[in-house]
Amino acid sequence: MSITGISPITEYLASLSTYNDQSITFALEDESYEIYVEDLKKDEKKDKVLLSYYESQHPSNESGDGVDGKMLMVTLSPTKDFWLHANNKEHSVELHKSEKPLPDQAFFVLHNMHSNSVSFESKTDPGVFIGVKDNHLALIKVDSSENLSTENILFKLSETHHHHHH
């Protein structure tokens, strides 16, 4: 599942919310960032995340797609030099400071199970998705494609503006 280019194909600055319209927020605590899932007050500003989209070859072309077997991978960065990472051992989603090239743990396969929502599958652990558990983000194992519509792995993107990548 190799990234086909070192530069993102497109980038968006967006706020991230759950399928139930709770906001994903990021707070700096003791020199590290915590990720929360919470209801915001009416006029409270939503945190923004830079989503960078990369093209990736599908790991197997057994479907007959040949060169066409592409997927979109995303990285999510709520603040400069910090990216969401999948910690597959702890089944957790964490914010870590990283330098480019980013590690595989920072990449997630983009899914649209519905046109108005997205899901993020761990590049390093196929079948495991970013999801909501106890008001935090966690890694959740999805055992069949029917369960991809389960609400706790569905997120909404509210795009604030396009990010011009140079």
């Epitope: 479907s63 797609d65 979109l72 983009l110 649209n112």
Partner: antibody, heavy 122, light 107 residues
């Protein structure tokens, strides 16, 4: 290789309905969104809507809500579009299309069927 | 809905010429733009996506550019087989909308 084969031309009467098919091969049908596009002399190219065979989720252009119904048959890797209450405005070529990416709709049309010509006339 | 306006409506050029056509969006669409080529009696073909990325198998004489509201498709050293209609399309957000097309004829 990727193929989208559409059903043949249809001549239909005003007020009637028409259902056209898009038989696909050469790729994993359930993993790609399928879109439908209308091409007419009056309005050029118009996106009608899209459907994801995996979940059955669909998404429509407001202008075609109530006009078009999208379905799929996963067992035969075939997408269908039914147009109802036809008028002369619906006379056009209709294309089924598929995007370049597994799992994700960016509403980009990388593969196209050959088109189905629908003529509405009494 | 965002309106995509293409110019010119048509152009007549000689083989070997360089040609540039334009597409203007009524609002900022970032780099969410695709270009298609359609020859008479055929289905459209994807040429460029995300404003400047050439699709698989597309000759490198086709180049896309622009960002925000103003985009271009350039064909360097036009070939006889490039005679066609060219359409721009806003991608990513629903509903995607197409421009009215530019017709390229070969003298």
């Amino acid at each position: 290789q990727v193929k989208l084969l559409q059903s043949g031309a249809a001549l239909v009467k005003p007020g009637a309905s028409v259902k056209m098919s898009c038989a696909t091969s050469g790729f994993s049908f359930t993993d790609y969104w399928v879109s439908w596009v209308k091409q007419s002399h009056g309005k050029g190219l118009e996106w009608i809507g899209e459907i994801y065979p995996n979940s059955g989720a669909d998404n429509f252009n407001e202008n075609f809500k109530g006009k078009a119904t999208l379905t799929v048959d996963k067992s035969t890797s075939t997408a269908y579009m039914e147009l109802s209450r036809l008028t002369s405005e619906d006379s056009a070529i209709y294309y089924c299309t598929r995007g370049p990416y597994y799992y994700s709709t960016q509403i980009i049309f990388a593969y196209w069927g050959q088109g189905t010509l629908v003529t509405v006339s009494s | 809905n965002i309106v995509m306006t293409q110019s010119p409506k048509s152009m007549s050029i000689s083989v070997g010429d360089r040609v540039t056509m334009n597409c203007k969006a009524s609002q900022n669409v970032g780099n969410n733009l695709a270009w298609y080529q359609q020859k008479p009696g055929q289905s459209p073909k994807l040429l460029i996506y995300y404003a400047s990325n050439r699709y698989t198998g597309v000759p490198d004489r086709f180049t896309g550019g622009g960002y925000g509201t103003d985009f271009t498709l350039t064909i360097n050293s036009v070939q006889a087989e490039d005679a066609a209609f060219y359409y721009c399309q806003r991608i990513y957000n629903s509903p995607p909308t197409f421009g009215g097309g530019t017709k390229v004829e070969i003298k």
